[in-house]
């Protein structure tokens, strides 16, 4: 048999092989498609299925506009004029070109060392539904899953049956200073069918910034607690990507896994004392916080004139 | 919203020719196979003729064939039925009808047009 | 010339009552049968397309299946407005054929 493929909404003729060009014909096409159960022998008289299949007088069949539901096989037997059957086989592929395809959403820069999201890669209205691929620099991405990670998507018109594809791409770039250049492109997997290319995107990479600086929350606010309280430190840095942050109290290390909370429950007078953080990021060394003081205190010096400081070390008039 | 307005029934004798119309508006007309259907007076459906939608190919019944011609003026959104060499037996309501083919089998109809065959 | 052998011709039934009409084919149509509701000095109202789908704006009371050649409508609980005379038609082959009607009138 033979393989076809037709664009969608196309023509298509298929030519029964050793049929008379012109009548008198000893022929029959029969057809295996979307449009039916089993084979469907066309009538030559022609009939209702003339308006997707259509016996030509010279024996070949029409297709006037090829859709999705005309995937399948066609064959015609024929009686040549010396008496001999010829039978020729059809294998009826259909395709749909997409428009051309878009980055959606793109960065307007990236981090190194950092997931960076890329931009979305959009086609609209492929048959079959085909591939999207990443390119950087011109180099085609393969997915690693740490590195450079894809998400994809695939949906199908409900009427149309088409499909669109989406690809998000997440890279985690090694070192800033560069300008690579992203495109997408989507290929349908026919022979001799070129992709179709999105316009490149050019992106800068720069080195994780500096903490702007580093701050030092505490709850409750001023560090007076009443014993038995809880006490919140908060280190809070505005850095890309968040630093481990170690603890310093009094001028020494607290033995503590690297956390950017540090919570004192129960707070006793042992707990009292000058609390520091100090953030470390990869690429900028140690960053030390200002210094906060907790004091616990029975009824807390600037705590009210009568009446006690409550767990919550706010004060409750008697 | 798709409508289709039959005209030009009426009485005529046996032998007589009539030109029957049909209106179509409301869908893309050239996009359409179109038929005729006949209903006899206390009696059952029974199809006339089919075109296709460029009007180059059109189909018949045997009980017809050779005496009614379908044709379409696609820039008038128009359907039309020539019937000669009338019987008393093509006494019937005309209903004209949009499809025909395999993708829309019949969906939509007229109310119709009664044409009486009678001496 | 295929043939659609449309039954019962015609049926008496009550207000909510479930009501089955069938037609066989003479020969396989695939799945190329319309159903049409005819109420009197009026034109048929396609019902179902296709064999099984309901068509536009019709209540979901009506269904229609297939079996082979067999082809079937249901009202799965008739009411007033639905006494009338049903037909169905295959569209696979010329001479499109109708079946020969069945009327459902109240009992």
């Known amino acids: 048999g033979q393989n076809i493929t037709a664009r969608i909404g196309e023509p298509l003729v298929l030519s029964c092989k050793g049929a008379p060009k012109k009548p008198p014909q000893q022929l029959e096409w029969k057809l295996n498609t979307g449009r039916t159960e089993a084979w469907k022998v066309l009538s030559p008289q022609g009939g209702p299925w003339d308006s997707v299949a259509r016996i030509l007088p010279n024996g070949s069949l029409l297709l006037p506009a090829t859709g999705i539901v005309d995937e399948g096989t066609f064959r015609c037997r024929a009686t040549n004029r010396r008496g001999k059957e010829v039978k020729s086989n059809y294998r009826v592929r259909v395709y749909q070109i997409p428009g051309k395809p878009e980055i959606v959403d793109p960065a307007s820069e990236l981090t190194a060392s950092v997931p960076n999201k890329v931009g979305t890669c959009v086609s609209e209205g492929s048959y079959p539904a085909g591939t999207l691929s990443w390119h950087l620099d011109g180099k085609l991405l393969i997915p690693d899953g740490k590195e450079t990670l894809v998400k994809e998507e695939t949906r199908r018109h409900p009427e149309t049956g088409l499909f669109t594809l989406r690809s998000e791409l997440t890279v985690i770039p090694t070192q800033g200073g560069t300008h690579p250049t992203f495109s997408c492109s989507f290929s349908l997997g026919l022979p001799r069918r070129r992709p179709l290319n999105t316009a490149p995107i050019q992106l800068r990479v720069r080195e994780p910034g500096p903490p702007e600086g580093i701050q030092l929350l505490v709850e409750p606010e001023g560090g007076i607690v009443a014993p038995g309280g809880t006490v919140t430190l908060t280190c809070a840095i505005s850095a890309q990507p968040p630093p481990q942050v170690h603890w310093i109290k009094d001028g020494a290390p607290l033995p503590l896994a690297p956390s950017p909370v540090l919570l004192l429950p129960e707070v006793g007078h042992e707990d009292e004392g000058t609390y520091s953080c100090v953030a470390t990021h990869p690429s900028h060394g140690p960053q030390e916080s200002p210094p906060v003081s907790i004091r616990v205190t029975e009824t807390g010096d600037e705590g009210p004139a009568e009446g006690s400081v409550g767990e919550s070390g706010l004060g409750t008039l008697a | 919203e798709v409508q289709l307005v039959e005209s030009g029934g009426g009485l005529v004798q046996p032998g007589g020719s009539l030109r029957l119309s049909c209106a179509a508006s409301?869908?893309?007309?050239?996009?359409?196979?179109m038929t005729w259907v006949r209903q006899a007076p206390g009696k059952g459906l029974e199809w006339v003729a089919s075109?296709?939608?460029?009007?180059?190919?059109?189909y018949y019944p045997d009980s017809v064939k050779d005496r009614f011609t379908i044709s379409r003026d696609n820039a008038k959104n128009s359907l039309y039925l020539q019937m000669n060499s009338l019987r008393a037996e093509d006494t019937a309501v005309y209903y004209c009808?949009?499809?025909?083919?395999?993708?829309?089998?019949?969906?939509?109809w007229g109310q119709g047009t009664l044409v009486t065959v009678s001496s | 010339d295929i043939q659609m052998t449309q039954s019962p011709s015609s049926l008496s039934a009550s207000v909510g009552d479930r009501v089955t009409i069938t037609c066989r084919a003479s020969?396989?149509?695939?799945?190329?049968v319309n159903w049409f509701q005819q109420k009197p000095g009026k034109a048929p109202r396609r019902l179902i397309y296709?064999?099984?789908n309901l068509a536009d704006g019709v209540p979901s009371r009506f269904s229609g299946s297939r079996s082979g050649t067999d082809f079937t409508l249901t009202i799965s609980s008739l009411q007033p407005e639905d006494f009338a005379t049903y037909y169905c038609?295959?569209?696979?082959?010329?001479?499109?054929?109708f079946g020969g009607g069945t009327k459902v009138e109240i009992k």
């Open positions: 009808a949009r499809g025909g083919d395999i993708t829309t089998g019949l969906d939509y």
């Open positions: 409301g869908f893309t007309f050239n996009n359409y196979w």
């Open positions: 075109i296709d939608n460029s009007g180059d190919n059109t």
């Open positions: 020969q396989d149509v695939g799945f190329y």
């Open positions: 296709r064999a099984t």
């Open positions: 038609l295959e569209f696979d082959e010329h001479p499109l054929t």
